[in-house]
Interface confidence: low
């Protein structure tokens, strides 16, 4: 299934810790892309893989 | 937080009508605002919601054609428009903002 | 859409009672499912969302709970201004539909 991705509202600028907020339009429910190093529903977690 | 509705509506049938829900408080662009409807003795339903920062909509199937959500980010108000009315399109219809600020209500009457 | 099915339509209790009212989705809903109380004259006041994350200013004495398909939502210790109808809302999807609603009233 293909996601559709909107920037999600100001009000969700803090929902992923160490991300970029994505709303879901299939879900219309905010996701996290993380960034480089990090995992988590809302990056909130240190790769130690990486 | 606050949200203002318009006024009472009496309106003919087959006329159509425009509500207004203005935010103070806080402005419309960091989150959805929806429209919701209560027929007399009825229960809640959802009409639909925009995202006033794009004007992207969303409208349950049964208000697709009935009802059309705007927002004006200049004046922080979104507006609800009714078409074709019909005496079961009387009811109050209620706004909100991040489905935990609601506005008080606005009656619309449908009557020859 | 996700139908969800609320019981029951109206109960009586006593004041100090517990009352539990049920929604049950057509759909698993993830638990995004949010509980409203609503009094004549008045918008919709949300008490809880994401099951059982009580709204702030909200007494201890609301509570929900459940997952998949089946969601409750519970007064306890009844007061008089408790009066009103219940509400479910799922938002798991773009289609937001509430719950049939609960009129509860004081014996």
């Known amino acids: 299934v293909v996601s559709h991705f909107n920037d999600c509202p100001d009000s969700h600028t803090q929902f992923c810790f160490h991300g970029t907020c994505r709303f879901l339009v299939q879900e219309d429910k905010p996701a996290c892309v993380c960034h480089s190093g990090y995992v988590g529903a809302r990056c909130e977690h240190a790769d130690l893989l990486a | 937080v606050q949200l203002q509705q318009s006024g009472a509506e009496l309106v003919r049938p087959g006329a159509s009508v425009k509500l207004s829900c203005t935010a103070s408080?806080?402005?419309?662009?960091?989150?959805?605002m929806y429209w919701v409807k209560q027929r007399p003795e009825q229960g809640l339903e959802w009409i639909g919601r925009?995202?006033?920062?794009?004007?992207?909509?969303k409208y349950a199937p049964k208000f697709q054609d009935k009802a059309t959500i705007t927002a004006d980010t200049s004046s922080n108000t979104a507006y609800l428009h009714l078409s074709s009315l019909t005496s079961e399109d009387t009811a109050v219809f209620y706004c909100?903002?991040?489905?935990?600020?609601w506005g008080q209500g606005t009656l619309v009457t449908v009557s020859a | 859409d996700i139908q969800m099915t609320q019981s029951p339509s109206s109960l009586s209790a006593s004041l100090g009672g517990k009352v539990t009212i049920t929604c049950k989705a057509s759909q698993d809903i993830n638990k995004y499912i949010a509980w409203y109380q609503h009094k004549p004259g008045k918008g919709p006041r949300l008490f809880i969302h994401y099951t059982s994350k009580l709204q702030p200013g909200i007494p201890s004495r609301f509570s929900g709970s459940g997952s998949g398909r089946d969601y409750s939502f519970s007064i306890s210790n009844l007061e008089p201004e408790d009066i009103a109808t219940y509400y479910c809302?799922?938002?798991?999807?773009?289609?937001?539909?509430f719950g049939g609603g609960t009129k509860l009233e004081i014996k």
């Open positions: 925009i995202d006033p920062a794009n004007g992207n909509t």
């Open positions: 909100a903002y991040r489905r935990a600020y």
């Open positions: 408080g806080f402005n419309i662009k960091d989150d959805y």
């Open positions: 809302l799922q938002y798991d999807n773009l289609l937001y539909t």
